[in-house]
Interface confidence: low
């Protein structure tokens, strides 16, 4: 069974669908890609989508509203952090307050810090408005102090 990133997700609510993440890039001095044991940084990110209204549909992953917003956000983050080091996102949650989005981002350790995560996201806000019709405000980024260990067979949410 291929081993991927270990999951340290906190309990999700109505949003247990997750974006995929990938093992580290293979280096040429390995005959097979390495089993991951350390070296992942997690960041908790929260922001408001001020031009959308929260309703009960965002508590139900089967609704079109939930699925379209979740997909747009997943696609958006792949665009923002498409440089090497981004491993994916998980634990997307929607909250009332226009729409408040909370999620966890994973990067290979040492490739990015909290400041850069926030800066890159803020730089993308204009494009998010035009491409996805999402007006983003009140961005907050913080480190997630997960203890990290890779157990055999554990995986980041796909």
């Amino acid at each position: 069974t291929p081993t991927t990133l270990a999951s340290h997700s906190t309990k999700t609510d109505a949003s247990s669908t997750h974006h995929s993440s990938v093992p580290p890039l293979t280096s040429s001095n390995h005959s097979t890609s390495p089993q991951l044991s350390t070296g992942v940084s997690f960041f908790f990110l929260s922001f408001h989508i001020s031009n959308l209204q929260f309703n009960s549909s965002l508590e139900d992953p089967s609704t079109d509203y939930y699925q379209e917003l979740q997909r747009d956000i997943s696609e958006m983050f792949l665009q923002i952090y498409k440089q090497g080091g981004f491993l994916g996102l998980s634990n997307i949650k929607f909250r009332p307050g226009s729409v408040v989005v909370q999620l966890t981002l994973a990067f290979r350790e040492g490739t990015i810090n909290v400041h850069d995560v926030e800066t890159q996201f803020n730089q993308y806000k204009t494009e998010a408005a035009s491409r996805y019709n999402l007006t983003i405000s009140d961005v907050s980024v913080s480190d997630v102090p997960f203890p990290f260990s890779a157990q055999s067979g554990a995986g980041v949410p796909g």
């Epitope: 109505a14 997750h18 995929s20 139900d60 699925q67 949410p157 796909g158």
Partner: antibody, heavy 116, light 107 residues
Amino acid sequence: EVQLQQSGPELVKPKTSMKISCKASGYSFTDFTMNWVKQSHGKNPEWIGLITPYNGGTSYNQKFKGKATFTVDRSSSTAYMELLSLTSEDSAVYYCARGLTYFDQWGQGTTLTVSS
Amino acid sequence: QIVLTQSPALMSASPGEKVTMTCSASSSVSYMYWYQQKPTSSPKPWILLTSNLASGVPTRFSGSGSGTSYSLTISSMEAEDAATYYCQQWNSKPPITFGGGTKLEIK
């Protein structure tokens, strides 16, 4: 170790229904989306749809709406797919598979044969 | 829905030979995933997000591409690589779709 253990092979008659189970172990069942995939003999896989175990939210491939119904039992970490009004076209191997954008863990497959 | 067309459908290669198979999408996709499947076994994730090898995959494998054109390459064919390879896309709209597969045989 992460495992998805599916129920055994089934031989059923046309126009009946049947339910396949997929028992998850080695991870937090409610933290991961579960998908169902059909693979007819010698053909490529087809995504049937997914279920979010935390609250039972579902998303179906339009092609399989009305054919498949997903449920979960969180207490036993088991996902189920019921297939309705079976015909010979439904004969295939069915997999449960974990993930949203790709499938990092797969069950061993359940072979369904529909024959009178 | 997005249709993935793999070519060739069937190919054979000698040990040590370079192998390339392609996956063409009916419209642009952001990323491609590849799976390896051997008879009577479940598919295994092989290449993730276009070019990242899944854990345990030999480094002779590589993936590349963008837009509507993607490929999987084996730099030096080995007997254990004989299998069927499927591409799979995830795009912003469902459903997830798989290609028709490339069956790779060893000469």
